[in-house]
């Protein structure tokens, strides 16, 4: 009797797991054994492909075989008695593309209020993923243990801190991991829970926020008890991406060291240009508070968020305004290199009534006005990322004149 | 395979210095905290600082800020300890640890045997 | 600074028992909390960290627990290998400090 070809081969790819399962063609058959051959792009001849020779089951790994991932790679299967049936070529593929990022692991640490994550990629040191380590982004569910109300947490990175959390429970999560760069979406890891603990008898500062005077820097927090002393670390905000490594190394700020204030201040140059977090903590000489919330500081946005500059275009019934970058001194354009949100606010020039848009873009519309009418605009930049949530000042008001009627083509 | 070297034993007379040394295998010391612990015969572990081989930064626990002094050579991937002022109570083993993943230690050295006497 | 109080200096128990060895801390530390064995003679070495997770190549009768100020080494079914000092270390806030040890004999 003629052996039958083995139907229906799938290539399972998670992470650097190479996983091929089929179906028997003929189960009254017993005894068989299957074996497989892979050929890369631009070869001929085909290779025993090493780990599912005369396989009795049906399902093998051929992760140990070491591949271009980038390559494409195309597969044949054939059953084996005493003779063998015909080959069962499967579909060619680019194990790159086929595979799936694994479950994350995750490292839980509790406070009192709030719970440290830290992600790792499920496969150490992973071919697969080899050139996207430092693209990884985890997105994460959260639940109290007693209610099972979800909360999403999007684009995380290696390590994020929840907080505003109620002491003394449990909270379960589980993440994974996205590439976007590559439009894959991982699988969770498995449900982790922790117990937040008693509250601390000393609460973390709250509401910090970074100014600047003169070439200074001020940082300001805001504190429960009197007669207490404060520390401040700061830490690159990249090194939050680092996939393999979770020590992170926060460092002092010198003139903000057990500091009886709160505030300190420290010149400008301790910081190179750059994003950083901030962190403070309080003592009374016995406890010590668990440390505040980390908030987020970017240099280039603190020193100068400056206004933006803006042209108008007047029709009869709207004027659209194109918003350039500011100018400083020496008329040559600031690069602002982080996503803004402009307010433009607007007002007939007899009236105090203002309007306002919020736009993302640099070309706005702002309608429904009256012919041959006066209107006064002014504009200020906000940063998109609400830890930063820093504003400019208003661009001084510009005042322009609405065309007669049908000029709005 | 991570391993920190240190050396068996040291002999030395009271009021002098010493230097102790840890040398690292197996891990780049600039990618971790290095750490100095002490523990004398029959008693307890005692951490006596750290060091950031990265750029130096150093913390020390308040009883031994004026006595140990921690310093690490990158180029050599060795950190280590100098104690000055020698007494008695300074005999003890000496640990050098790598400081891991989330501050742990996580490798130890075998130790120094530091013997104060005249 | 944070006081690692380790109770018990001597435990006692036998080989196939399971055995608790506490620690608790002078404020609360979260769960940043390590255990080390020192066996007679050697250098100690890593158990848990984070207060229950283990390192690689412990076996899994070692286990951590606890948060806050009480922290807590069980050992269950007790090997002749595990006759060692158990210390406790909060990794929180410098200094770091360990507790005094807990010594555990094996009848």
């Known amino acids: 009797k003629n052996l039958k070809s083995p139907q229906k081969v799938e290539v399972d790819i998670i992470d650097d797991n190479f996983i091929l399962r089929w179906n028997r063609s003929d189960e009254s058959v017993g005894n068989v054994t299957f074996s497989f051959d892979y050929q890369k792009t631009g070869m001929d001849n085909w290779i025993k492909l090493s780990g599912c020779q005369n396989i009795t089951s049906t399902k093998c790994n051929f992760s140990s075989l070491k591949l271009n991932v980038y390559e494409e790679i195309k597969l044949r299967i054939r059953a084996e008695k005493e003779n063998t049936s015909s080959w069962y070529e499967v579909d060619s593929f680019t194990p790159f593309r086929k595979a799936q990022i694994g479950p994350p692991e995750v490292h839980l640490e509790a406070e009192d209020k709030a719970i440290v994550i830290h992600i790792s990629p499920g496969t150490k040191d992973s071919v697969m993923w080899a050139l996207d380590g430092l693209s990884f982004t985890y997105s994460l569910v959260i639940w109290k243990n007693s209610s099972g109300v979800e909360e999403r947490i999007e684009n995380i990175y290696s390590r994020h801190k929840i907080y505003k959390l109620s002491p003394e429970t449990t909270y379960c999560l589980k993440v994974k991991a996205a590439l976007l760069t590559s439009w894959k979406i991982g699988v969770y890891s498995p449900v982790h829970c922790i117990k937040t603990t008693v509250e601390n008898e000393l609460p973390p500062p709250e509401n910090i926020e970074v100014s600047v005077q003169n070439q200074n820097y001020v940082l300001k927090w805001d504190y429960t008890y009197a007669n207490m002393t404060f520390q401040v670390q700061w830490l690159h905000a990249f090194l939050k991406r680092n996939p393999g490594n979770h020590l992170y190394k926060w460092k002092q700020i010198p003139d903000c060291e057990n500091v009886k204030t709160t505030q300190c201040v420290f010149p400008q140059n301790v910081f190179q240009k750059g994003i950083y977090l901030l962190r403070v903590q309080a003592s009374d000489g016995n406890n010590t508070s668990f440390w505040s919330e980390e908030i987020k500081f970017d240099t280039e946005i603190q020193a100068f968020l400056l206004p933006p500059v803006f042209n108008i275009r007047s029709l009869s019934d709207s004027f659209h305004i194109y918003i350039g970058a500011p100018k400083q001194s020496g008329n040559t354009p600031v690069i602002q290199d982080y996503p803004l949100i402009y307010e433009i606010i607007f007002w007939e020039n007899t009236s105090n009534a203002e309007r306002k848009i919020i736009e993302k873009k640099t070309d706005v519309t702002v309608p429904n006005l009256k012919p041959l009418t006066v209107y006064c605009v002014k504009a200020r930049a906000h940063t998109m990322d609400e830890k930063l949530n820093k504003s400019s000042v208003f661009s001084d008001a510009v005042c322009e004149k609405t065309k007669p009627g049908n000029t709005s083509k | 395979e991570v391993q920190l070297q240190q050396f068996g034993a040291e002999l030395v007379k009271p009021g002098a210095s010493v230097k102790l040394s840890c040398t690292a295998s197996g891990f780049n010391i600039k990618d971790y905290y290095m750490h100095w612990v002490k523990q004398r015969t029959e008693q307890g572990l005692e951490w006596i600082g750290r060091?950031?081989?990265?750029?130096?930064?150093?913390k020390y626990a308040p009883k031994f800020q004026v006595k140990a002094t921690i310093t690490a050579d990158t180029s050599s991937n060795t950190a280590y300890l100098h104690f000055s002022s020698l007494t008695s109570e300074d005999t003890a083993v000496y640990y050098c640890?790598?400081?891991?993943?989330?501050?742990?230690?996580?490798?130890w050295g075998q130790g120094t045997t530091l013997t104060v006497s005249s | 600074d944070i006081v690692m109080t380790q109770s018990q200096k001597f435990m006692s128990t036998s080989v196939g028992d399971r055995v608790s060895v506490t620690c608790k801390a002078s404020?609360?530390?979260?769960?940043?909390v390590a255990w080390y064995q020192q066996k007679p003679g050697q250098s100690p070495k890593a158990l848990i960290y984070s207060a229950s997770y283990r390192y690689s190549g412990v076996p899994d009768r070692f286990t951590g627990s606890g948060s806050g100020t009480d922290f807590t080494l069980t050992i269950s079914n007790v090997q002749s290998e595990d006759l060692a000092e158990y210390f406790c270390?909060?990794?929180?806030?410098?200094?770091?400090?360990f507790g005094g040890g807990t010594k555990l004999e094996i009848k």
């Open positions: 270390q909060q990794c929180i806030n410098y200094p770091y400090t």
């Open positions: 404020q609360n530390v979260g769960t940043n």
């Open positions: 060091i950031d081989p990265e750029d130096g930064e150093t």
């Open positions: 640890v790598r400081g891991g993943n989330f501050y742990y230690f996580d490798y």
